[in-house]
């Protein structure tokens, strides 16, 4: 099951995948000046059995000005060095995601692809917070959030995650006032079916990738 | 609540170009392709283009090359261009919206419609 939106934003933080469960999608789009060769894919899609999980399908761009020919370009440097994306990249992963069954890692970068990724997550994906340079974070509580479902719904959980200014005076984390949940009511309030694949396994797996997660910041 | 509200249709001469325009309330459409369908009396509901966020675009080997669909994020508004216009292409033509990457989705499983604008093209 797709999740109906993105991971929320969260004021001065950006959020990254470290490992992408199956059925997740990701876009096939080709930066300015390009586009998706005609008889390529439209998505990439993560795949797999029980031992291995991998993306099927290969994203190719080739120049707009050109019909269907792949203009095999290794991207310079400085044009991986554009790309932005509400999840963060990372040139180098911080865990070993092939140890988490049924996961996808980061797919590679592609010739010409666009300078943002859309990723089209399921139920069960979860996403690491962190504050943009210059910005500190203060913690109540983890700084991920999953796609759940609920009354045959999908959402995500509200990251518990504040990112200040180095030089601004502000509350403490205990001094916080609450945030309503996305619903308006705490999330234990929540009688129905949550469906929550694969929470306890990654929340172990992130409290062990706490300290590496993002060491790793990408220039 | 999401809607979709297609304006632009008309009746026009074979040759001549309409371009149809969907405005999209309701919800951030940034995971979302948006879309355009057609349906000719007696006839299955037929897809025409998509357009995701970033602009990667799909076209139904039936209209491309004639056809050509754009998105304005800010506005959450999709348009389609339509030029050299058929009698063929008579039809009510209906703005989508769906979850996931730019694919042509069968129109049963298409998440939100418009209410749809009619298209004539005399000959």
């Known amino acids: 099951e797709l999740c109906d939106d993105d991971p929320p934003e969260i004021p001065h933080a950006t959020f990254k995948a470290m490992a992408y469960k199956e059925g997740t999608m990701l876009n096939c789009e080709c930066k300015r000046g390009f586009r998706r060769i005609k008889s390529g894919s439209l998505y990439m899609l993560c795949t797999g059995n029980s031992s291995h999980s991998s993306w099927d399908n290969q994203c190719q761009c080739t120049s707009s000005a050109t019909r269907n020919t792949t203009k095999q370009v290794t991207p310079q440097p400085e044009e991986q060095k554009e790309r932005k994306t509400t999840e963060m990249q990372s040139p180098m992963q911080p865990v070993d995601q092939a140890s988490l069954p049924g996961h996808c890692r980061e797919p590679p970068p592609w010739e010409n692809e666009a300078t943002e990724r859309i990723y089209h997550f399921v139920v069960g994906q979860m996403v690491y917070y962190q504050c943009v340079q210059g910005y500190r974070a203060l913690h109540r509580g983890p700084a991920e959030s999953v796609c759940k479902m609920t009354h045959g719904k999908t959402r995500w959980t509200q990251p518990q995650l504040i990112c200040t200014g180095e030089m601004e005076t502000s509350q403490f984390p205990g001094e916080e006032k609450p945030q309503a949940s996305p619903e308006g009511r705490p999330e234990s309030e929540t009688s129905c079916l949550v469906t929550t694949t694969d929470f306890q396994i990654q929340t172990e797996m992130a409290a062990t990738m706490e300290t590496s997660i993002f060491t790793t910041e990408y220039q | 609540q999401v809607q979709l509200v297609e304006s632009g249709g008309g009746l026009v001469q074979t040759g001549d170009s309409l371009r149809l325009s969907c405005a999209a309330s309701?919800?951030?459409?940034?995971?979302?392709?948006l879309a355009w369908y057609r349906q000719a009396p007696g006839k299955e509901r037929e897809f025409l283009a998509a357009i995701s966020w970033l602009d990667g675009t799909l076209y139904a080997d039936s209209v491309e090359g004639r056809f050509t669909i754009s998105r304005d994020n800010p506005k959450n508004t999709v348009h389609l261009q339509m030029d050299s216009l058929k009698p063929e292409d008579t039809a009510v033509y209906y703005c989508?919206?769906?979850?996931?990457?730019?694919?042509?989705?069968?129109?049963?499983?298409?998440?939100?419609w418009g209410q749809g604008t009619q298209v004539t093209v005399s000959s």
């Open positions: 309701g919800r951030s459409f940034r995971n979302y392709i």
């Open positions: 989508a919206a769906d979850r996931g990457p730019v694919r042509p989705v069968l129109a049963p499983d298409v998440d939100y």
